[in-house]
Protein backbone atom coordinates (compact mmCIF):
# COMPACT_ATOMS: atom_id res chain seq x y z
CA UNK A 1 0.00 0.00 0.00
CA UNK A 2 1.00 3.64 -0.50
CA UNK A 3 3.00 4.94 2.44
CA UNK A 4 5.80 7.22 3.58
CA UNK A 5 7.97 6.00 6.46
CA UNK A 6 10.28 8.46 8.17
CA UNK A 7 13.46 7.91 10.19
CA UNK A 8 13.40 7.94 13.97
CA UNK A 9 13.60 10.73 16.56
CA UNK A 10 16.83 12.69 16.89
CA UNK A 11 18.40 14.75 19.69
CA UNK A 12 20.92 17.32 18.48
CA UNK A 13 23.14 20.02 19.97
CA UNK A 14 22.78 23.66 18.88
CA UNK A 15 24.91 24.35 15.80
CA UNK A 16 24.75 20.75 14.62
CA UNK A 17 22.89 19.38 11.57
CA UNK A 18 20.16 16.78 11.26
CA UNK A 19 19.16 14.65 8.26
CA UNK A 20 15.69 13.10 8.22
CA UNK A 21 14.72 10.45 5.68
CA UNK A 22 11.35 9.64 4.13
CA UNK A 23 11.03 6.28 2.37
CA UNK A 24 8.24 5.88 -0.17
CA UNK A 25 6.55 2.63 -1.08
CA UNK A 26 3.54 1.60 -3.13
CA UNK A 27 3.94 4.23 -5.86
CA UNK A 28 6.41 5.50 -8.46
CA UNK A 29 8.18 8.40 -6.77
CA UNK A 30 9.13 10.03 -10.07
CA UNK A 31 5.52 11.09 -10.55
CA UNK A 32 5.54 13.23 -7.41
CA UNK A 33 7.00 16.11 -5.44
CA UNK A 34 8.01 15.53 -1.84
CA UNK A 35 7.37 18.39 0.55
CA UNK A 36 8.70 18.92 4.05
CA UNK A 37 6.58 20.58 6.71
CA UNK A 38 7.44 21.09 10.36
CA UNK A 39 5.43 21.71 13.50
CA UNK A 40 6.99 23.13 16.65
CA UNK A 41 5.28 22.14 19.92
CA UNK A 42 1.80 23.69 20.05
CA UNK A 43 2.45 25.69 16.86
CA UNK A 44 1.00 25.84 13.37
CA UNK A 45 2.31 23.77 10.47
CA UNK A 46 5.19 25.44 8.64
CA UNK A 47 6.15 24.63 5.05
CA UNK A 48 9.90 24.27 4.45
CA UNK A 49 10.34 23.30 0.81
CA UNK A 50 9.97 20.59 -1.80
CA UNK A 51 11.85 18.45 -4.24
CA UNK A 52 10.65 17.34 -7.65
CA UNK A 53 11.39 13.62 -7.44
CA UNK A 54 11.62 13.36 -11.23
CA UNK A 55 14.50 15.79 -11.75
CA UNK A 56 15.65 16.78 -8.21
CA UNK A 57 14.70 20.46 -8.68
CA UNK A 58 14.12 22.08 -5.29
CA UNK A 59 12.34 25.15 -3.97
CA UNK A 60 12.69 26.32 -0.38
CA UNK A 61 10.83 28.77 1.80
CA UNK A 62 12.85 32.00 2.17
CA UNK A 63 12.94 31.46 5.95
CA UNK A 64 14.99 28.27 5.54
CA UNK A 65 17.01 29.21 2.45
CA UNK A 66 20.68 28.41 3.01
CA UNK A 67 19.97 26.18 6.01
CA UNK A 68 17.86 23.44 4.48
CA UNK A 69 18.80 20.95 1.77
CA UNK A 70 16.29 18.51 0.31
CA UNK A 71 17.64 15.62 -1.74
CA UNK A 72 16.43 12.29 -3.08
CA UNK A 73 17.76 8.86 -3.95
CA UNK A 74 15.46 7.35 -6.55
CA UNK A 75 17.11 3.93 -6.32
CA UNK A 76 16.16 3.83 -2.63
CA UNK A 77 12.78 5.57 -3.18
CA UNK A 78 13.79 7.95 -0.42
CA UNK A 79 13.75 11.73 0.07
CA UNK A 80 15.92 13.50 2.65
CA UNK A 81 15.72 16.81 4.47
CA UNK A 82 18.89 18.16 6.08
CA UNK A 83 18.72 21.20 8.36
CA UNK A 84 21.97 22.81 9.50
CA UNK A 85 23.00 25.34 12.16
CA UNK A 86 20.33 24.01 14.47
CA UNK A 87 18.95 26.15 17.28
CA UNK A 88 16.47 25.44 20.04
CA UNK A 89 13.61 26.93 17.99
CA UNK A 90 14.13 24.14 15.45
CA UNK A 91 12.78 21.63 17.98
CA UNK A 92 9.76 20.30 16.11
CA UNK A 93 8.12 17.33 14.44
CA UNK A 94 9.23 17.19 10.80
CA UNK A 95 6.84 15.65 8.26
CA UNK A 96 7.25 14.66 4.62
CA UNK A 97 4.17 14.86 2.41
CA UNK A 98 3.46 13.62 -1.10
CA UNK A 99 2.17 16.06 -3.72
CA UNK A 100 1.21 14.85 -7.21
CA UNK A 101 2.07 16.94 -10.27
CA UNK A 102 -0.67 19.52 -10.83
CA UNK A 103 -2.62 18.74 -7.65
CA UNK A 104 -1.02 20.97 -4.98
CA UNK A 105 -2.04 19.10 -1.85
CA UNK A 106 -0.60 16.36 0.35
CA UNK A 107 -2.63 13.19 0.09
CA UNK A 108 -0.09 11.01 1.94
CA UNK A 109 2.09 12.03 4.91
CA UNK A 110 4.92 10.42 6.78
CA UNK A 111 4.38 9.65 10.45
CA UNK A 112 6.62 12.53 11.54
CA UNK A 113 10.10 12.70 13.06
CA UNK A 114 10.69 14.54 16.32
CA UNK A 115 13.92 16.54 16.29
CA UNK A 116 14.93 17.96 19.67
CA UNK A 117 17.66 20.61 19.80
CA UNK A 118 19.10 20.93 23.26
CA UNK A 119 22.48 21.62 24.84
CA UNK B 1 4.17 35.72 1.30
CA UNK B 2 0.48 34.87 1.40
CA UNK B 3 -0.83 35.06 4.97
CA UNK B 4 -3.61 32.68 6.02
CA UNK B 5 -5.82 33.68 8.95
CA UNK B 6 -8.21 31.20 10.54
CA UNK B 7 -11.10 31.94 12.87
CA UNK B 8 -12.09 31.12 15.48
CA UNK B 9 -8.98 29.75 17.25
CA UNK B 10 -11.17 27.24 19.04
CA UNK B 11 -14.75 26.10 18.75
CA UNK B 12 -16.89 24.12 21.21
CA UNK B 13 -19.84 22.42 19.51
CA UNK B 14 -22.38 19.89 20.75
CA UNK B 15 -22.48 16.45 19.16
CA UNK B 16 -24.74 16.50 16.11
CA UNK B 17 -24.43 20.28 15.75
CA UNK B 18 -22.85 22.18 12.86
CA UNK B 19 -19.26 23.46 13.08
CA UNK B 20 -18.10 26.27 10.80
CA UNK B 21 -14.44 27.25 10.43
CA UNK B 22 -13.30 30.26 8.44
CA UNK B 23 -10.08 30.89 6.58
CA UNK B 24 -9.06 34.19 4.99
CA UNK B 25 -6.09 34.68 2.68
CA UNK B 26 -4.18 37.93 2.17
CA UNK B 27 -4.59 37.60 -1.61
CA UNK B 28 -6.86 35.74 -3.98
CA UNK B 29 -6.21 32.02 -4.35
CA UNK B 30 -8.24 31.76 -7.57
CA UNK B 31 -6.35 31.03 -10.79
CA UNK B 32 -8.66 32.57 -13.38
CA UNK B 33 -7.17 30.40 -16.13
CA UNK B 34 -7.86 27.05 -14.46
CA UNK B 35 -10.89 28.24 -12.48
CA UNK B 36 -9.51 26.58 -9.35
CA UNK B 37 -9.00 27.97 -5.86
CA UNK B 38 -5.77 26.52 -4.51
CA UNK B 39 -6.90 25.95 -0.95
CA UNK B 40 -6.94 22.70 1.04
CA UNK B 41 -8.21 21.71 4.48
CA UNK B 42 -6.48 19.23 6.79
CA UNK B 43 -7.51 17.58 10.05
CA UNK B 44 -4.88 16.80 12.69
CA UNK B 45 -5.38 14.70 15.80
CA UNK B 46 -2.85 14.63 18.66
CA UNK B 47 0.28 12.67 17.85
CA UNK B 48 -0.74 12.11 14.24
CA UNK B 49 0.22 13.71 10.92
CA UNK B 50 -2.41 15.90 9.25
CA UNK B 51 -5.03 14.21 7.06
CA UNK B 52 -6.31 15.73 3.81
CA UNK B 53 -10.04 16.50 3.89
CA UNK B 54 -10.76 18.99 1.10
CA UNK B 55 -8.73 20.28 -1.85
CA UNK B 56 -9.34 22.95 -4.50
CA UNK B 57 -11.55 24.65 -1.89
CA UNK B 58 -14.52 22.31 -2.28
CA UNK B 59 -13.47 18.86 -3.56
CA UNK B 60 -13.74 16.17 -0.88
CA UNK B 61 -10.85 13.69 -0.72
CA UNK B 62 -11.93 10.10 -1.28
CA UNK B 63 -12.92 8.35 1.92
CA UNK B 64 -13.76 11.58 3.75
CA UNK B 65 -17.34 11.54 5.16
CA UNK B 66 -19.79 13.81 3.39
CA UNK B 67 -20.50 15.74 6.58
CA UNK B 68 -17.29 17.62 5.71
CA UNK B 69 -17.69 20.27 3.02
CA UNK B 70 -15.64 23.18 1.79
CA UNK B 71 -16.79 26.37 0.14
CA UNK B 72 -15.59 29.83 -0.82
CA UNK B 73 -13.56 31.50 -3.53
CA UNK B 74 -10.93 34.18 -3.87
CA UNK B 75 -9.90 35.15 -0.34
CA UNK B 76 -12.68 33.75 1.89
CA UNK B 77 -13.15 30.06 2.57
CA UNK B 78 -15.17 27.90 4.93
CA UNK B 79 -14.95 24.35 6.21
CA UNK B 80 -18.27 23.02 7.50
CA UNK B 81 -18.89 19.89 9.55
CA UNK B 82 -22.64 19.47 9.20
CA UNK B 83 -23.18 17.18 12.18
CA UNK B 84 -20.25 16.92 14.56
CA UNK B 85 -19.20 13.39 15.59
CA UNK B 86 -16.95 12.49 18.52
CA UNK B 87 -14.13 11.46 16.16
CA UNK B 88 -14.11 14.96 14.58
CA UNK B 89 -12.46 16.47 17.65
CA UNK B 90 -9.15 17.73 16.24
CA UNK B 91 -7.30 20.78 14.99
CA UNK B 92 -8.21 21.90 11.47
CA UNK B 93 -5.80 23.76 9.18
CA UNK B 94 -6.33 25.54 5.90
CA UNK B 95 -3.40 25.72 3.48
CA UNK B 96 -2.85 27.75 0.33
CA UNK B 97 -0.87 26.42 -2.61
CA UNK B 98 -1.40 29.34 -4.98
CA UNK B 99 2.15 30.54 -4.36
CA UNK B 100 4.47 28.16 -2.52
CA UNK B 101 2.63 26.99 0.64
CA UNK B 102 1.29 28.62 3.80
CA UNK B 103 -0.88 27.15 6.54
CA UNK B 104 -3.43 28.92 8.69
CA UNK B 105 -2.96 29.01 12.45
CA UNK B 106 -5.41 26.18 13.07
CA UNK B 107 -8.84 25.90 14.69
CA UNK B 108 -9.31 23.52 17.59
CA UNK B 109 -12.72 21.82 17.56
CA UNK B 110 -13.93 20.31 20.82
CA UNK B 111 -17.19 18.97 22.19
CA UNK B 112 -19.37 21.29 24.26
Amino acid sequence: QVQLVQSGAEVKKPGASVKVSCKASGFNIKDYYMHWVRQAPGQRLEWMGWIDLENANTIYDAKFQGRVTITRDTSASTAYMELSSLRSEDTAVYYCGRDAYGRYFYDVWGQGTLVTVSS
Amino acid sequence: DIVMTQSPDSLAVSLGERATINCKSSQSLLNARTGKNYLAWYQQKPGQPPKLLIYWASTRESGVPDRFSGSGSGTDFTLTISSLQAEDVAVYYCKQSYSLRTFGGGTKVEIK
Epitope: Y33, W50, G102 | N31, Y38
Partner: antibody, heavy 127, light 107 residues
Framework: QVQLVQSGAEVKKPGSSVKVSCKAS????????ISWVRQAPGQGLEWMGG????????NYAQKFQGRVTITADESTSTAYMELSSLRSEDTAVYYC????????????????????WGQGTLVTVSS | EIVLTQSPGTLSLSPGERATLSCRAS???????LAWYQQKPGQAPRLLIY???SRATGIPDRFSGSGSGTDFTLTISRLEPEDFAVYYC????????FGGGTKVEIK
Protein backbone atom coordinates in the same frame (compact mmCIF):
# COMPACT_ATOMS: atom_id res chain seq x y z
CA GLN C 1 -5.93 39.95 -23.76
CA VAL C 2 -2.45 38.50 -24.27
CA GLN C 3 -0.94 38.82 -27.76
CA LEU C 4 2.32 37.24 -28.90
CA VAL C 5 4.31 38.60 -31.84
CA GLN C 6 7.31 36.67 -33.14
CA SER C 7 10.41 37.74 -35.07
CA GLY C 8 10.71 37.15 -38.82
CA ALA C 9 11.82 34.19 -40.92
CA GLU C 10 15.45 33.07 -40.81
CA VAL C 11 17.70 31.11 -43.18
CA LYS C 12 20.65 29.43 -41.45
CA LYS C 13 23.60 27.23 -42.33
CA PRO C 14 23.99 23.75 -40.77
CA GLY C 15 25.98 23.93 -37.55
CA SER C 16 24.98 27.53 -36.78
CA SER C 17 22.46 28.83 -34.20
CA VAL C 18 19.20 30.70 -34.47
CA LYS C 19 17.47 32.91 -31.89
CA VAL C 20 13.75 33.58 -32.26
CA SER C 21 11.95 36.21 -30.19
CA CYS C 22 8.37 36.37 -28.94
CA LYS C 23 7.08 39.71 -27.63
CA ALA C 24 4.05 39.66 -25.36
CA SER C 25 1.55 42.42 -24.80
CA UNK C 26 -1.37 42.41 -22.37
CA UNK C 27 -1.45 40.59 -19.03
CA UNK C 28 1.36 40.24 -16.51
CA UNK C 29 4.24 38.73 -18.51
CA UNK C 30 6.35 37.73 -15.50
CA UNK C 31 3.75 35.44 -13.98
CA UNK C 32 2.58 33.46 -16.96
CA UNK C 33 4.33 30.68 -18.80
CA ILE C 34 5.68 30.69 -22.33
CA SER C 35 6.34 27.52 -24.33
CA TRP C 36 8.01 26.92 -27.65
CA VAL C 37 6.52 24.40 -30.07
CA ARG C 38 7.80 23.54 -33.53
CA GLN C 39 6.25 22.04 -36.63
CA ALA C 40 8.35 20.61 -39.46
CA PRO C 41 6.82 20.82 -42.97
CA GLY C 42 3.80 18.50 -43.20
CA GLN C 43 4.44 17.18 -39.69
CA GLY C 44 2.79 17.40 -36.28
CA LEU C 45 3.47 19.67 -33.31
CA GLU C 46 6.42 19.14 -30.98
CA TRP C 47 6.90 20.83 -27.59
CA MET C 48 10.47 22.04 -27.08
CA GLY C 49 10.40 23.63 -23.65
CA GLY C 50 8.93 26.37 -21.52
CA UNK C 51 9.68 29.09 -19.00
CA UNK C 52 7.86 31.08 -16.32
CA UNK C 53 9.68 34.45 -16.36
CA UNK C 54 9.11 35.13 -12.65
CA UNK C 55 11.16 32.00 -11.83
CA UNK C 56 13.66 32.44 -14.65
CA UNK C 57 14.61 28.80 -15.08
CA UNK C 58 13.43 26.93 -18.16
CA ASN C 59 12.50 23.28 -18.62
CA TYR C 60 13.13 21.39 -21.82
CA ALA C 61 11.92 18.32 -23.64
CA GLN C 62 14.50 15.54 -23.45
CA LYS C 63 14.98 15.58 -27.22
CA PHE C 64 16.22 19.18 -27.21
CA GLN C 65 18.13 19.15 -23.91
CA GLY C 66 21.58 20.72 -24.42
CA ARG C 67 20.70 22.26 -27.78
CA VAL C 68 17.92 24.66 -26.87
CA THR C 69 18.00 27.64 -24.52
CA ILE C 70 14.82 29.46 -23.56
CA THR C 71 15.13 32.82 -21.81
CA ALA C 72 12.87 35.74 -20.93
CA ASP C 73 13.46 39.45 -20.51
CA GLU C 74 10.84 40.86 -18.16
CA SER C 75 11.80 44.46 -18.95
CA THR C 76 10.73 44.03 -22.58
CA SER C 77 8.10 41.28 -22.05
CA THR C 78 9.97 39.14 -24.55
CA ALA C 79 10.79 35.44 -24.54
CA TYR C 80 13.56 33.93 -26.65
CA MET C 81 14.33 30.48 -28.00
CA GLU C 82 17.84 29.75 -29.20
CA LEU C 83 18.57 26.49 -30.99
CA SER C 84 22.19 25.57 -31.69
CA SER C 85 24.04 23.01 -33.87
CA LEU C 86 21.35 23.36 -36.52
CA ARG C 87 20.77 20.59 -39.01
CA SER C 88 18.43 20.28 -41.99
CA GLU C 89 15.83 18.41 -39.89
CA ASP C 90 15.45 21.59 -37.77
CA THR C 91 13.77 23.31 -40.72
CA ALA C 92 10.35 24.09 -39.25
CA VAL C 93 7.92 26.75 -38.15
CA TYR C 94 8.67 27.68 -34.54
CA TYR C 95 5.78 28.91 -32.44
CA CYS C 96 5.68 30.50 -29.02
CA UNK C 97 2.51 30.10 -26.97
CA UNK C 98 1.29 31.11 -23.57
CA UNK C 99 1.30 28.10 -21.23
CA UNK C 100 3.83 25.55 -20.05
CA UNK C 101 4.07 22.65 -17.64
CA UNK C 102 4.02 23.85 -14.05
CA UNK C 103 7.34 22.62 -12.69
CA UNK C 104 7.09 25.21 -9.93
CA UNK C 105 4.46 23.37 -7.95
CA UNK C 106 2.24 26.36 -7.21
CA UNK C 107 -1.34 26.61 -8.43
CA UNK C 108 -1.07 30.28 -9.34
CA UNK C 109 1.29 29.28 -12.15
CA UNK C 110 -0.82 26.40 -13.44
CA UNK C 111 -0.92 27.52 -17.03
CA UNK C 112 -0.71 24.32 -19.00
CA UNK C 113 -2.66 24.54 -22.22
CA UNK C 114 -1.33 26.69 -25.04
CA UNK C 115 -3.36 29.80 -25.80
CA UNK C 116 -2.79 32.20 -27.50
CA TRP C 117 -0.04 31.38 -30.00
CA GLY C 118 2.42 33.60 -31.84
CA GLN C 119 2.12 33.74 -35.62
CA GLY C 120 5.08 31.40 -36.11
CA THR C 121 8.62 31.90 -37.39
CA LEU C 122 9.91 29.84 -40.30
CA VAL C 123 13.51 28.73 -39.79
CA THR C 124 15.12 27.16 -42.86
CA VAL C 125 18.40 25.28 -42.42
CA SER C 126 20.19 24.87 -45.70
CA SER C 127 23.76 24.85 -46.97
CA GLU D 1 6.90 10.20 -22.25
CA ILE D 2 3.16 9.88 -22.83
CA VAL D 3 2.36 8.95 -26.45
CA LEU D 4 -0.96 10.19 -27.86
CA THR D 5 -2.40 8.27 -30.82
CA GLN D 6 -5.14 9.95 -32.84
CA SER D 7 -7.57 8.14 -35.08
CA PRO D 8 -8.54 8.17 -37.80
CA GLY D 9 -5.64 9.85 -39.62
CA THR D 10 -8.13 11.37 -42.06
CA LEU D 11 -11.89 11.79 -41.85
CA SER D 12 -13.87 12.56 -45.04
CA LEU D 13 -17.26 14.04 -44.26
CA SER D 14 -19.87 16.37 -45.71
CA PRO D 15 -20.93 19.69 -44.17
CA GLY D 16 -23.73 19.11 -41.66
CA GLU D 17 -22.43 15.68 -40.64
CA ARG D 18 -21.09 14.73 -37.20
CA ALA D 19 -17.32 14.26 -36.79
CA THR D 20 -15.92 12.07 -34.02
CA LEU D 21 -12.18 12.22 -33.41
CA SER D 22 -10.39 9.89 -31.02
CA CYS D 23 -7.25 10.40 -28.94
CA ARG D 24 -5.76 7.50 -26.99
CA ALA D 25 -2.96 7.94 -24.43
CA SER D 26 -0.24 5.36 -23.71
CA UNK D 27 -0.89 5.91 -19.99
CA UNK D 28 -3.55 7.59 -17.92
CA UNK D 29 -3.82 11.37 -18.33
CA UNK D 30 -5.56 13.64 -15.83
CA UNK D 31 -8.65 15.10 -17.51
CA UNK D 32 -7.48 18.50 -16.27
CA UNK D 33 -4.48 18.13 -18.56
CA LEU D 34 -5.94 17.29 -21.95
CA ALA D 35 -6.59 19.84 -24.69
CA TRP D 36 -7.68 19.91 -28.34
CA TYR D 37 -6.47 22.33 -31.04
CA GLN D 38 -7.58 23.16 -34.57
CA GLN D 39 -5.01 24.12 -37.22
CA LYS D 40 -5.70 25.47 -40.69
CA PRO D 41 -3.03 25.67 -43.42
CA GLY D 42 -0.54 28.49 -42.86
CA GLN D 43 -1.97 29.35 -39.45
CA ALA D 44 -0.97 28.72 -35.85
CA PRO D 45 -3.00 26.16 -33.89
CA ARG D 46 -6.06 27.47 -32.06
CA LEU D 47 -7.22 26.17 -28.68
CA LEU D 48 -10.67 24.55 -28.81
CA ILE D 49 -11.02 22.47 -25.64
CA TYR D 50 -9.05 22.34 -22.37
CA UNK D 51 -9.52 20.18 -19.32
CA UNK D 52 -10.88 17.48 -21.68
CA UNK D 53 -14.32 19.09 -21.90
CA SER D 54 -14.18 22.87 -21.31
CA ARG D 55 -14.67 24.99 -24.40
CA ALA D 56 -12.19 27.83 -24.87
CA THR D 57 -13.52 31.38 -25.15
CA GLY D 58 -15.30 32.04 -28.43
CA ILE D 59 -15.48 28.40 -29.51
CA PRO D 60 -18.93 27.45 -30.93
CA ASP D 61 -20.93 24.89 -28.95
CA ARG D 62 -20.90 22.41 -31.83
CA PHE D 63 -17.43 21.50 -30.52
CA SER D 64 -17.42 19.26 -27.46
CA GLY D 65 -14.82 17.18 -25.67
CA SER D 66 -15.23 14.14 -23.48
CA GLY D 67 -13.34 11.21 -22.01
CA SER D 68 -11.04 10.32 -19.15
CA GLY D 69 -8.08 8.12 -18.33
CA THR D 70 -6.61 7.02 -21.65
CA ASP D 71 -9.51 7.64 -24.05
CA PHE D 72 -10.63 11.09 -25.15
CA THR D 73 -12.98 12.27 -27.89
CA LEU D 74 -13.56 15.51 -29.76
CA THR D 75 -16.99 15.76 -31.36
CA ILE D 76 -18.13 18.32 -33.92
CA SER D 77 -21.91 17.92 -33.92
CA ARG D 78 -22.58 19.50 -37.33
CA LEU D 79 -19.63 20.30 -39.58
CA GLU D 80 -19.50 23.82 -40.98
CA PRO D 81 -17.33 24.65 -44.02
CA GLU D 82 -14.82 26.46 -41.76
CA ASP D 83 -14.33 23.31 -39.62
CA PHE D 84 -12.32 21.45 -42.26
CA ALA D 85 -8.84 21.48 -40.76
CA VAL D 86 -6.35 19.35 -38.85
CA TYR D 87 -7.15 18.64 -35.17
CA TYR D 88 -4.56 17.80 -32.53
CA CYS D 89 -4.98 16.49 -29.00
CA UNK D 90 -2.35 17.41 -26.40
CA UNK D 91 -1.56 16.33 -22.86
CA UNK D 92 0.18 18.96 -20.77
CA UNK D 93 1.59 17.02 -17.88
CA UNK D 94 5.26 17.25 -16.96
CA UNK D 95 6.37 16.81 -20.58
CA UNK D 96 3.66 17.92 -23.02
CA UNK D 97 3.07 15.82 -26.12
CA PHE D 98 0.72 16.13 -29.07
CA GLY D 99 -1.13 13.50 -31.03
CA GLY D 100 -0.26 13.01 -34.70
CA GLY D 101 -3.36 14.89 -35.83
CA THR D 102 -6.61 14.04 -37.62
CA LYS D 103 -7.33 15.76 -40.91
CA VAL D 104 -11.03 16.50 -41.40
CA GLU D 105 -11.64 16.97 -45.13
CA ILE D 106 -14.67 17.50 -47.34
CA LYS D 107 -16.07 14.32 -48.88
Amino acid sequence: QVQLVQSGAEVKKPGSSVKVSCKASGGTFSSYAISWVRQAPGQGLEWMGGIIPIFGTANYAQKFQGRVTITADESTSTAYMELSSLRSEDTAVYYCARGAPNYYGSGGYDDGWFDPWGQGTLVTVSS
Amino acid sequence: EIVLTQSPGTLSLSPGERATLSCRASQSVSSSYLAWYQQKPGQAPRLLIYGASSRATGIPDRFSGSGSGTDFTLTISRLEPEDFAVYYCQQFGRFPTFGGGTKVEIK
